[in-house]
């Protein structure tokens, strides 16, 4: 959960407010209480954002872009609060806002710099392209341009491709990494310096498992303590890759503690789930169960991917029948 907005105090009656796209923010302004209060909020010294005087709003000449998006804290004006409540900020709202307050005893002017950030939750994806394997860190909408770093076995990687597409108000970014034939663990970090928000994706490949037909297999999936916070909402998904595409076997939502299972031979241990262990069992294996199994634990702040490769071999009985 993130605050409505946060303030950074800078000199000369100027504050910086950082807001998030489509969220509501407060542009702060205070004055020494007095009668006959007049409040004018303006954008870039040109556009009328909000006017209040003689005890009520006067929005006849308000710039249309602010219509139905602004209000004051009317019960607190008499106590010296001229702050502006600003709904659904967009990147076009970035800039300098001036609050003019006049009373029977004084006039003050405050400047507030509004910066707007975007950080739609990134994702880490594992993809097969022909014979190559790729990890892709991507963020659908981010502003300003983020810092993306990759690590292999905790060592920074200098090679860092970034595919960027810019829309009117934000960037969409993909950062693919070729991991063909690697058994290393990988980590991708995406940082939005304005919102002071960091997301981390971590990929781990487990040793391959060889099983006989009709046996069962246990696949481990436990979050790394560095990232995992059980109080935070997260989702766990187990899926199997077949011919280049993943099909979901089961998933668990921490918010509702719901488990949904799509494969009847799949089982989860409730006791273990309560201990944040999302290891699973797949019973009665058959040859078509061979493949890659992916456990994805995701929250707003991280994605943890664990890959298991399972080889199912025919049992002796089946082999002798053939």
């Amino acid at each position: 959960i993130f605050p409505l907005a946060f303030f950074i105090y800078v000199p000369m009656n100027e504050q910086i407010v950082i807001g998030r796209l489509d969220e509501d923010i407060i542009l702060p302004s205070s004055f020494e209480r007095g009668s006959e209060v007049v409040i004018h909020w303006k954008y870039q010294d040109s556009y009328k954002v909000h006017s209040y005087y003689k005890g009520s709003d006067h929005l006849e000449s308000q710039d249309p872009r602010y219509a139905n998006r602004t209000s004051l804290f009317y019960n607190e004006i008499q106590n010296g609060n001229a702050s502006l409540f600003f709904r659904r900020v967009s990147l076009l709202d970035e800039g300098i806002y001036t609050c003019y307050v006049g009373t029977a005893i004084q006039v003050i002017t405050n400047k507030v710099v509004l910066k707007v950030g975007v950080f739609l939750t990134p994702v880490m994806k594992y993809e097969k392209r022909n014979t190559n394997s790729f990890l892709i860190c991507s963020v659908l909408s981010v502003y300003p341009r983020p810092i993306i770093t990759w690590k292999m076995d905790n060592t920074p990687i200098s090679e860092n491709n970034m595919e960027e597409t810019g829309s009117l108000d934000s960037f969409s970014i993909n950062s693919p990494l070729n991991i063909t034939g690697s058994n290393s663990s990988y980590e991708c970090t995406i940082e939005n310096s304005l919102l002071k928000q960091t997301w981390t994706g971590r990929w781990t490949m487990k040793d391959g498992l060889h099983k006989m037909q009709s046996e069962h297999v246990s696949l481990s999936c436990q979050p790394v303590n560095d990232y995992f916070s059980p109080n935070q909402d997260f989702k766990v998904t187990w899926s199997r890759m077949k011919s280049g595409t993943f099909s979901v076997l089961a998933y668990y939502l921490s918010s509702s503690q719901n488990t949904i299972i799509n494969e009847s031979r799949f089982s989860w241990n409730k006791e273990l789930i309560n201990q944040s262990d999302f290891s699973m069992n797949l019973m009665d294996l058959n040859l078509s169960d061979s493949g890659e199994y992916l456990c994805n634990i995701s929250s707003d702040e991280y994605t943890l991917l664990t890959i298991h490769t399972v080889h199912v071999e025919p049992s002796q009985e089946t082999a002798s029948h053939n």
């Epitope: 007049v38 004018h40 003689k54 005890g55 003019y100 006049g102 002017t109």
Partner: antibody, heavy 121, light 107 residues
Framework: QVQLVESGGGVVQPGRSLRLSCAAS????????IHWVRQAPGKGLEWVAV????????YYADSVRGRFTISRDNSKNTLSLQMNSLRAEDTAVYYC??????????????WGQGTLVTVSS | DIQMTQSPSTLSASVGDRVTITCRAS??????LAWYQQKPGKAPKLLIY???SLESGVPSRFSGSGSGTEFTLTISSLQPDDLATYYC?????????FGQGTKLEIK
Amino acid sequence: QVQLVESGGGVVQPGRSLRLSCAASGFTFSDYGIHWVRQAPGKGLEWVAVIWYDGSDKYYADSVRGRFTISRDNSKNTLSLQMNSLRAEDTAVYYCARDRSSGAMGYFAYWGQGTLVTVSS
Amino acid sequence: DIQMTQSPSTLSASVGDRVTITCRASQSISSWLAWYQQKPGKAPKLLIYKASSLESGVPSRFSGSGSGTEFTLTISSLQPDDLATYYCQQYNSYSYTFGQGTKLEIK
């Protein structure tokens, strides 16, 4: 202390133009709305026009709308009233007066000494 | 426009008297009313704003009251220096309008 000094008054023929000025000092000019108020000889007071602190809003009395234009130069602390198509009934002492704040309140905390405009053929 | 009507037009009173001037608006103006004093040959001076708030530096013998359409200016104890014409003014809405004035004479 707050000072408002009007100038530019004089005798002018009907239909002609005149420009009044008001020089302000002793306060932050760009923080306050300024009005023009006039008073015909031996008569009462009549509000003429207002311009807001930032020049964004201007309002006029019906009797002068379309003929008079109020303007300000915040860098020079001056206010002007351009009066066109003058009529005999525009004869008056013209005062510039400072609003309590931005110009939005509409009453007059400080006044200049006035300048006389006489419209006569 | 909102019409402002003052009464009386002229008032004669003695030093020390309590004097009341009335101002009536043609429609409700809430409390958005100011009173001014103008001495002969001088610019007006603000006495009262928002119907009852005393402007800084104005003697406390001046007071204002009323709201809506009926307002009064009271001088609790008339002084020789109070010889002047008094104007009410509404600032509820454009166009701002003044009363016709009340001329106060000292007996």
